[in-house]
Interface confidence: medium
């Protein structure tokens, strides 16, 4: 997420070929430009080795955590719920993104030495990770809404439908990340190390803005509204019916959603502000431009950190995950079977109770 860089970017190079009179970055200001403030592009100054260490830590945590999550879900074939399938895909998305982090880390030190193909692939995986994440969480919210508010098990009973939804999510995520695949490339220059960034050439401003607004709308705002609607009604139903057990069972899902929003909402709000400024809804000033650039740097790290946080949530809040993990360790003789909790069940995220399936 280009510019996301969405960052992204998340869509980074939106100024090429546009009238730059409103944002004149001036190294030294001649007398006739005294009315225009001197302005150079700025971003946070962070030591590149610190960035590499962060990447390495997130990579190791994400690789270990998400591999374990996938292992536990795949082991518990018997009581696997719909939510489990979504969480399995969520872990897969995080794992795929984590695998790109060593490449980003290496590029921080040596520049982008991996060529355009890898530039496109690793950038795509970052975007797909974000979009699939929010779309899967939206699907979980719909599933919980149907199960708790409408007491229906339609989705739960039709496993093929869940698989189709997951495949559709991956397909839609790829579609939303397509601008990155199209425009990201390795740019070679005599003055700087090779760089992997969004080079949109001389496309018209409208076309470029459309490619930024569409993914932001359909990939972030729409799923966010779905989640707010579904969880709003789900919470209302739980509180009205005093469903203590089910409320506890929803803790992990709420934690997952909350962490996702805390990690990705700031970055996407900054990206939205950036888009509004580029479309001149908000007036562009040098100060605002640089504030946004610094804010993109400050908030993007939260999105990167997110890929290793879900397993920690399951480990600390999800009782069933802990039990499932201990069960696998016991099966392989890594721990004594006596140390297994008495209520340890084969399901990763829960047992069916009435018309709902409790989670984690």
């Amino acid at each position: 997420m280009e510019d996301f860089n969405m960052e992204s970017d998340s869509f980074e190079d939106f100024w090429k070929g546009e009238d730059l009179s409103n944002y004149s970055y001036s190294s030294t200001l001649p007398p006739f430009l005294l009315d225009a403030a001197p302005c150079e592009p700025e971003s946070l100054e962070i030591n590149k080795y610190f960035v590499v260490i962060i990447y390495a830590l997130v990579f190791l945590l994400s690789l270990l955590g998400n591999s374990l999550v996938m292992l536990v879900i795949l082991y518990s074939r018997v009581g696997r719920s719909v939510t489990d399938v979504y969480l399995l895909n969520l872990a897969l998305a995080d794992l795929l993104f984590a695998l790109t982090l060593p490449i980003w880390a290496a590029s921080k030190v040596n520049g982008w030495i991996f060529g355009t193909f890898l530039c496109k692939v690793v950038s795509l995986l970052k975007e797909v990770n974000f979009y699939s994440g929010i779309l899967l969480l939206a699907c979980i919210s719909v599933d919980r809404y149907l199960a708790i508010v409408h007491a229906t098990r339609t989705l739960t009973q039709k496993r093929y439908l869940v698989k189709f939804i997951c495949l559709s999510i991956w397909g839609l995520s790829l579609l939303l990340a397509l601008p990155v695949l199209l425009f990201r490339r390795t740019v070679y220059s005599s003055n700087v190390s090779p760089a992997c960034y969004e080079d949109m050439g001389n496309n018209t401003a409208n076309w470029r803005m459309l490619l930024r607004i569409l993914p932001q709308s359909f990939g972030f705002i729409v799923p966010l509204l779905i989640m707010l609607f579904c969880y709003g009604f789900t919470l209302r139903t739980l509180f009205k019916a005093h469903m203590g057990q089910k409320h506890r069972a929803m803790r992990v899902i709420f934690a997952v959603v909350l962490i996702f929003l805390l990690c990705w909402l700031p970055y996407n709000l900054v990206l939205l502000a950036d888009t509004l400024m580029r479309t001149q809804v908000i007036q562009e000033t040098c100060e605002r431009r640089n504030h946004i650039d610094r804010a993109l740097d400050a908030t993007e790290i939260l999105g990167i950190l997110h890929s290793c946080l879900n397993p920690l949530i399951y480990a600390f809040i999800g009782q069933k995950f802990r039990h499932g993990l201990l069960k696998i360790l016991a099966i392989h003789g890594l721990i004594s079977k006596d140390s297994l909790p008495k209520d340890s069940r084969p399901s990763f995220v829960g047992s069916s109770s009435g018309h709902t399936s409790t989670t984690l």
């Epitope: 980074e12 090429k16 003055n191």
Partner: nanobody, 126 residues
């Protein structure tokens, strides 16, 4: 940090010639347009000539046929060859460049900036 360094200005007699050069340095990804502007005392700034990365050239009517702009993309340098100089060409000549630079800690983002040099004085007088 990007810097534009001009050179070649000075005192010249009417009908004489001068060659201005402007070199861009720093973390530059690409330079889109490079050009020369001038400002005579008490007058507004005006475009003298500019040249795109593709080689498209634009001249002010007052200098057509006398001035020639050229650039060396490999050296990030723009030149202005000034022939048949007139007293009315006396001004401070500023180098201007539309430069793409990279910003960003985690993911690199391209930003295009309009950079200016400090100026070089050209005096045409007998």
């Amino acid at each position: 940090e990007v810097q534009l360094l001009e050179s070649g200005g000075g005192l010249v007699q009417p009908g004489g010639s001068l060659r201005l050069s402007c070199a861009a340095s720093g973390s530059i990804v690409r330079i889109n347009t490079m050009g020369w502007y001038r400002q005579a005392p008490g007058k507004q700034r005006e475009l003298v000539a500019d040249i795109t990365s593709g080689g498209n050239i634009n001249y002010a009517d007052s200098v057509k046929g006398r001035f020639t702009i050229s650039r060396d993309n490999s050296k990030n340098t723009v030149y202005l060859q000034m022939n048949s100089l007139r007293p009315e060409d006396t001004a401070v000549y500023y180098c201007n460049a539309e430069i793409v630079v990279l910003v960003g800690v985690w993911t690199q983002r391209a930003r295009t900036g309009n950079y200016w040099g400090q100026g070089t004085l050209v005096t045409v007088s007998s």
